[in-house]
């Protein structure tokens, strides 16, 4: 007699075989907050940007990627304290002389109004009200993201 | 009438509420290989270490973390070609003068016998037979990992 969870494993496996989708997260893990189709984890501790990237990765997540101004505002609304800064997944690419998301896409200049310099060793943080360029070695909090809904398996045949 | 997948969402949600576990991956995605309780993605293309870290992260996975010599050997057994090197999630921390996994733990000196120098801008790669220190800017393949089984949500509270 299979448990309901074991049965689910079979059901979802069969579904994935048909659709090449993976189950994805069905709901946000403990300590993560849902924002639309994402789960966000706002760290309490601080780290340089590269350690923050590594931390999100070991949590099988990504530093926050922000699609547009609307998503930025909704994310900022979740920040309680005006004085706190959080790393997101955007830094300055010296070779490409541009702000670059960790997924490889360049920043659309209309999306975020960045305060500070675009130069080597600059990474992007957000506060409750603004977006800042900081030295990547600065130790501040960070935000990890996970896709909440089942996503088409585009990244898997993907890598 | 709920579909079996919708029912599963409820079942797994209820299970998670009881155990604070998340569903995790029920099976490995396309192109990923199962090794015990992990799904591994051996890239075909090449990247510097930091780009490899970012690639795994955007795939909601981590550069490979190796627990012990036994896991190293089993991973190496999946590498077909003697000449190919793969980045893993281990690099040299200059400030701490030690090899450090991307999850923040230090290398147990008994686990891996590293060929090459422990110095700034050194990252670790594995081949079919050995473990090497390479310049992090070198373009080689990389290995991403995802936990296959539902994992206790141990990595989330401590951020």
């Amino acid at each position: 007699q299979k448990s309901s969870i074991e049965k689910c494993s079979v059901d979802i496996q069969q579904s994935r075989n048909k659709t090449t989708e993976r189950p994805g997260l069905l709901n946000c893990p403990i300590y993560w907050q849902q924002l639309r189709e994402k789960c966000l984890l706002f760290s309490h501790t601080v780290n340089p940007w590269n350690n923050s990237l590594a931390d999100c990765s070991t949590k099988e997540s990504s530093l926050l990627l922000i699609r547009d101004k609307d998503e930025l505002i909704h994310t900022q609304n979740l920040i309680r304290d005006k004085a706190i800064l959080f790393w997101i997944g955007l830094n300055f690419s010296l070779s490409e002389k541009n702000w670059k998301w960790i997924n490889g896409s360049f920043l659309n200049s209309n999306d975020l109004e960045i305060r500070g310099d675009a130069k080597e060793n600059s990474c992007i943080s957000i506060s409750q009200t603004s977006v800042y360029s900081e030295y990547c070695s600065t130790e501040i909090r960070w935000i990890c993201q996970k896709e909440l809904t089942p996503v088409r398996n585009k990244v898997y045949p993907d890598s | 009438q709920k579909s079996s997948i919708e029912k599963c969402s409820v079942d797994i949600q209820q299970s998670r509420n009881k155990t604070t576990e998340r569903p995790g991956l029920l099976n490995c995605p396309i192109y990923w290989q199962q090794l015990r309780e992990k799904c591994l993605l051996f890239s075909h293309t090449v990247n510097p270490w930091n780009n490899s870290l970012a690639d795994c992260s955007t795939k909601e996975s981590s550069l490979l973390l190796i627990r012990d010599k036994d896991e190293l050997i089993h991973t190496q057994n999946l590498i077909r070609d003697k000449a190919i090197l793969f980045w893993i999630g281990l690099n040299f921390s200059l400030s701490e003068k030690n090899w450090k996994w991307i999850n923040g733990s230090f290398l147990n000196s008994n686990d891996l016998e590293i060929r090459g120098d422990a110095k700034e801008n050194s990252c670790i790669s594995i081949s079919q037979t050995s473990v090497y220190s390479e310049y992090c800017s070198t373009e080689i393949r990389w290995i991403c990992q995802k936990e296959l089984t539902p994992v206790r949500n141990k990595v989330y509270p401590d951020s």
Epitope: W101, S105, K154, P157 | H44, N47, D55, T58
Partner: antibody, heavy 121, light 107 residues
């Protein structure tokens, strides 16, 4: 819109040179290895060359090795193919192609429309 | 280099027919095989990757199977828009190699 657009093809004499360009848009170009694939008139597909995402690693088909050079400018989202010492057998439609995943060289899910290179005296 | 041999080189079929195209690799490539469709004057279109995974937007009448050295593309019920040339391609090792193509013509 996700697309690749080749340019730079044309008529060239044997021994001559051409530089093809491929402008990418709508996806994270700098995270993907990219390839050139060609097709001679009435013939099948032939892979020509590939370049890693960061641009430091390149590969070539034996038929073009030493004559063609692949390169990329990630700041411009552009892929290039410098073709020297052209021969009649290089006459083909040249396509740039993107793989399905950032970890793959092949399984091309996005192709340009192609640019015709004709080598003739 | 891995040689990819496709057969037949051409096939005549009618709408509604089941069409099978085979591809053989000169050495084992696990499941690193893709299938493409190409129509005259157009770029190729990815149909199947990883030997059997259907690319997004491709009709379910297309299916792929096989592993190692022998692979098959099947069109379960041929439609008018399926008349084209089909290519297999191995992605196991560089250089990437394609099969010679199979032209599916109207009977």
């Amino acid at each position: 819109e996700v697309q690749l657009l080749e340019s730079g093809g044309g008529l060239v004499q044997p021994g001559g040179s051409l530089r093809l360009s491929c402008a990418a848009s709508g996806f994270a170009f700098s995270t993907y290895a990219m390839s050139w694939v060609r097709q001679a008139p009435g013939k099948g597909l032939e892979w020509v060359s590939a370049i890693s995402a960061a641009g430091g690693t390149t590969y070539y088909a034996d038929s073009v090795k030493g004559r063609f050079t692949i390169s990329r400018d990630n700041s411009k989202n552009t892929l290039y193919l410098q073709m020297n010492s052209l021969r009649a057998e290089d006459t083909a439609v040249y396509y740039c192609a993107k793989p399905l995943d950032s970890s793959l060289w092949a399984d091309f899910d996005l192709w340009g429309r192609g640019t015709l290179v004709t080598v003739s005296s | 280099d891995i040689q990819m041999t496709q057969s037949p080189s051409s096939v005549s079929a009618s709408v509604g027919d089941r069409v099978t195209i085979t591809c053989r690799a000169s050495q084992g490539i696990d499941s690193w095989l893709a299938w493409y469709q190409q129509k005259p004057g157009k770029a190729p279109k990815l149909l199947i990757y990883a030997a059997s995974s259907l690319q997004s937007g491709v009709p379910s009448r297309f299916s792929g199977s096989g592993s190692g050295t022998d692979f098959t593309l099947t069109i379960s019920s041929l439609q008018p828009e399926d008349f084209a040339t089909y290519y297999c391609q191995q992605a196991s090792v560089l250089p990437i190699t394609f099969g010679g193509g199979t032209k599916v013509e109207i009977k």
